[in-house]
């Protein structure tokens, strides 16, 4: 159950998606990708309040545990709930392939 | 593709499966689980240097722009690749029930 | 594997509107960096861009046919249709649907003749 | 718009033949070219992108090259199913092909 999505702390600060603009050096793939030349990477980024977009039981016991023993436990982290797929057009031995990778950009986010 | 599983930081400092013994009290569920009284609760904590066990491209891709730009994109984080399903014996409006959860307990760790 | 199907009215009349439809299997268009051309081939002669439509729904036109034409897709049949208006005998060619991976035309289908004639 | 020229329109070879055809671009599209091969009745194959790499599955006898505005296919050795219309595209700027070389058996 995701839990609620308003953010305690204001406008933008909690997990969720993000744009983040890298090219093919940024991302070490300079060797074997062509195209794209350029990738919009979305990745989940924020804080993870208590609750707030819990993805599950085990989110929610960490919250408890985390407010108990927060040197021990950590607070929940902010990552993908599911992902879009996307293409890339890659350098093999004989010359390019086209390859679909379904875990490569984050479509909504999570805190677990 | 779970990359390597050896620790830079030293044993045990890097994403791993750890039990943290917790009270129905520490969780919070005292109002509506009669049992178990306490919960080895398994979750995933430690770091996530580069390329420890990353979970998909995703997290290689976060690697890589978390060492460009360390201020905008967080390092990849240690949570749950499976789970071990777990019963409780919850309080009802007229006596008792067994629920199985599934999300419970963290079963392995990876970092994404 | 990727199969790209083209359809069409095979003649149609001048100054009516031409209206393809590729039906695409072996890939989504859901996927970043794939999308779906249409090129188009006069009797006996080269090959002409028309439009494009990508996995974000940006949409491409060749210049010299903008005001004529329209493309569009249905993510969820694998379809993309293409309009092109007001038709004239200059028209008349073979008409390929393409995948296009990052404005590549990786594969193509197999082609519908379209023939404008009263 | 950019405009390929190929040439030459047309050539005739025999089997084993080195074959090269030349494309020129109107300006500079880097290394943004691919080349497809035309059998009569039949629709474009790709064979080379981004100016020098094979697609899977191309024959190792195909082999491309250039940068800038010049750029090159050769068949190294031709081959009996080789005899087709080969065109270079650009995708630097909106997609515009070459006119097409005809390659017939002498």
């Known amino acids: 159950a995701r839990n609620g999505d308003h953010c305690p702390l204001g406008p933008g600060r909690c997990c969720r998606l993000h744009t983040v603009r890298a090219s093919l050096e940024d991302l070490g793939w300079a060797d074997w990708v062509l195209s794209p030349r350029e990738v919009q990477v979305t990745m989940c980024i924020g804080a993870c309040p208590s609750q707030f977009r819990a993805a599950n039981m085990h989110a929610q016991i960490k919250t408890s545990l985390h407010r108990l023993k927060p040197d021990t436990v950590p607070a929940p982290c902010c990552v993908p709930a599911s992902y879009n797929p996307m293409v890339l057009i890659q350098k093999t031995d004989t010359g390019v392939s086209l390859q679909t990778y379904d875990d490569l950009l984050a479509k909504d986010c999570h805190c677990i | 593709a779970r990359n390597g599983d050896h620790c830079p930081l030293g044993p045990g400092r890097c994403c791993r499966l750890h039990t943290v013994r917790a009270s129905l009290e520490d969780l919070g569920w005292a109002d509506w689980v009669l049992s178990p009284r306490e919960v080895q609760v398994t979750m995933c904590i430690g770091a996530c240097p580069s390329q420890f066990r990353a979970a998909n491209m995703h997290a290689q891709i976060k690697t890589s722009l978390h060492r460009l730009k360390p201020d905008t994109v967080p390092a990849p984080c240690c949570v749950p690749a499976s789970y071990n399903p777990m019963v409780l014996i919850q309080k009802t409006d007229t006596g008792v029930s067994l629920q199985t959860y599934d999300d419970l307990l963290a079963k392995d760790c990876h970092c994404i | 594997q990727v199969q790209l199907q083209e359809s069409g009215p095979g003649l149609v009349k001048p100054s009516e509107t031409l209206s393809l439809t590729c039906t695409f299997s072996g890939f989504s268009l859901s996927t970043s960096g794939m999308g779906v051309g249409w090129i188009r081939q006069p009797p006996g002669k080269g090959l002409e861009w028309l439009a494009h439509?990508?996995?974000?729904?940006?949409?491409r036109y060749n210049p010299a046919l903008k005001s004529r034409l329209t493309i569009s897709k249905d993510t969820s049949k694998s379809q993309i249709s293409l309009k092109l208006s007001s038709v004239t005998a200059a028209d008349t060619a073979v008409y390929y649907c393409a995948q296009m991976a990052w404005d590549w035309f990786a594969y193509w289908g197999q082609g519908t003749t379209v023939t404008v004639s009263s | 718009d950019i405009q390929m020229t190929q040439s030459p329109s047309s050539l005739s070879a025999s089997v084993g033949d080195r074959v090269t055809i030349t494309c020129k671009a109107s300006q500079n599209v880097d290394t943004d070219v691919a080349w497809y091969q035309q059998k009569p009745g039949q629709s474009p194959k790709a064979l080379i992108y981004s100016a020098s790499y094979r697609y899977s599955g191309v024959p190792s006898r195909f082999s491309g090259s250039g940068s800038g505005t010049d750029f090159t296919l050769t068949i190294s050795s031709l081959q009996p199913e080789d005899f087709a219309t080969y065109y270079c595209?650009?995708?630097?700027?909106?997609?515009?092909f070459g006119q097409g070389t005809r390659l017939e058996i002498k």
């Open positions: 595209h650009q995708y630097n700027s909106y997609p515009t």
């Open positions: 439509i990508r996995w974000d729904d940006v949409k």
